[in-house]
């Protein structure tokens, strides 16, 4: 008799999820010598323990605490780059500017980036058919709770000048409902963070508007100012040139506005 299985609205666990997490962990510890002491099998066991045999709508931050402990890592608090809806460029930037970090440049962020996972209550099975959708099913699902947990802690760790890359091509350049808008903004510590500097990335080559005057950016400025953190904003009119100039800052064309 086939067992009844809950059907969720979201895609199921990424195929070969255990193998992927383990392989990513091994790769990360090989690339980052300061993390070579990490026992990747223990990391996978802690990751698995956070959601296996648990109802996928009833996951808590506490479930991930064993994983958080194993992912302990040094991150220079004044070199943090947050991003919203522009992940690829943010990652391209930190691949060049190696002393800056996005969340996905940390072990925990790297492990989970672009993956989906969930289990089922009272069984040790991973659900590869479907997982809860944040909107249609429930917000306390394994993936959402993981990212909320690590994003909050990443923001809490930040100090001095914190940078955030925002997508100027979106209708809401700053979206209060994004992870940045709903979690990270509210967990920057005013006693540690002096300034939030937004980099608004332009999409069109002929777009010369000052997107720092966008109403949603003004909303972000208001939220940040009320938290006693200074706010500044820069337009990045040519992201391609921006990256090129990060790679080659001595280039003569890099003195002009980008």
């Amino acid at each position: 008799v086939p067992r009844w299985r809950q059907q969720w609205s979201g895609p199921g666990t990424t195929k070969r999820f255990p193998e992927t997490v383990l392989a990513r962990c091994v790769k990360y510890t090989e690339i980052h010598p300061e993390m070579r002491h990490v026992d990747c099998q223990s990391v996978w066991d802690a990751f698995k323990g956070a959601f296996i045999s648990k109802h996928p709508c009833n996951i808590t931050e506490e479930d991930y605490q064993p994983l958080m402990k194993l992912g302990t890592q040094t991150v220079p608090c004044n070199k943090i780059l947050l991003w919203s809806r522009i992940k690829d460029l943010a990652h391209q930037f930190t691949q060049v500017q190696r002393d800056m970090f996005t969340l996905e440049d940390t072990l925990l962020g790297y492990l989970a980036d672009d993956l989906t996972w969930c289990g089922e209550f009272n069984t040790s099975k991973i659900n590869y058919q479907s997982c809860p959708d944040w909107r249609k099913d429930c917000s306390n699902n394994p993936v959402s709770v993981f990212w909320k947990t690590v994003s909050r802690r990443f923001a809490e760790a930040a100090c001095d000048v914190v940078h955030v890359m925002l997508n100027g091509s979106r209708s809401k350049i700053f979206d209060k409902n994004s992870t940045f808008g709903s979690v990270e903004v509210h967990n920057l510590q005013p006693e540690k963070v002096q300034t939030l500097e937004a980099w608004v990335i332009h999409g069109g080559r002929e777009d010369s508007r000052d997107l720092c005057q966008d109403p949603t950016i003004k909303e972000l400025e208001s939220i940040i100012s009320k938290r006693n953190i200074q706010f500044s904003c820069k337009n990045i009119y040519r992201p391609d040139k921006f990256l090129q100039c990060v790679k080659n800052p001595e280039d003569s064309s890099c003195t002009s506005e980008i």
Epitope: M68, G71, T72, Q73, T74, L108, V150, R153, A157, E191
Partner: nanobody
Framework: EVQVLESGGGLVQPGGSLRLSCAAS????????MSWVRQAPGKGLEWVSA????????DYADSVKGRFTISRDNSKNTLYLQMNSLRAEDTAVYYC??????????RGQGTLVTVSS
């Protein structure tokens, strides 16, 4: 600016005890959870223990549970780590840091604990 100064380390025999202190300044100490982390020679960073801002909630790494006790005195802006039944594998530089991790940027110089006979 967050500043911390760790002290209390030293050379101790296996089975012995030490009490580490961390004097904090530059922030409202009582509002922040605090952690002890350590780095053994040639190894990576290991989280040891954390305590809530009020001091009523604590957590420990499995490797130190039952041997180490974290505490704080908010009136003195000071964090403590009482270490009993010390083992050779506890040898490390111990740092205190704000927050519960997993992301740390330690501001102090740390204090070296050496467990050896």
């Amino acid at each position: 600016e967050v500043q911390v100064l760790e002290s209390g380390g030293g050379l101790v025999q296996p089975g012995g005890s030490l009490r580490l202190s961390c004097a904090a300044s530059g922030f409202t100490f009582s509002r922040y959870a605090m952690s002890w982390v350590r780095q053994a020679p040639g190894k990576g960073l290991e989280w040891v223990s954390a305590i809530s801002g009020s001091g009523d909630s604590t957590d420990y790494a499995d490797s130190v549970k039952g041997r180490f006790t974290i505490s704080r005195d908010n009136s003195k802006n000071t964090l403590y780590l009482q270490m009993n039944s010390l083992r050779a594998e506890d040898t490390a530089v111990y740092y205190c840091a704000d927050g519960t991790g997993p992301f740390f940027d330690y501001r102090g110089q740390g204090t070296l604990v050496t467990v050896s006979s």
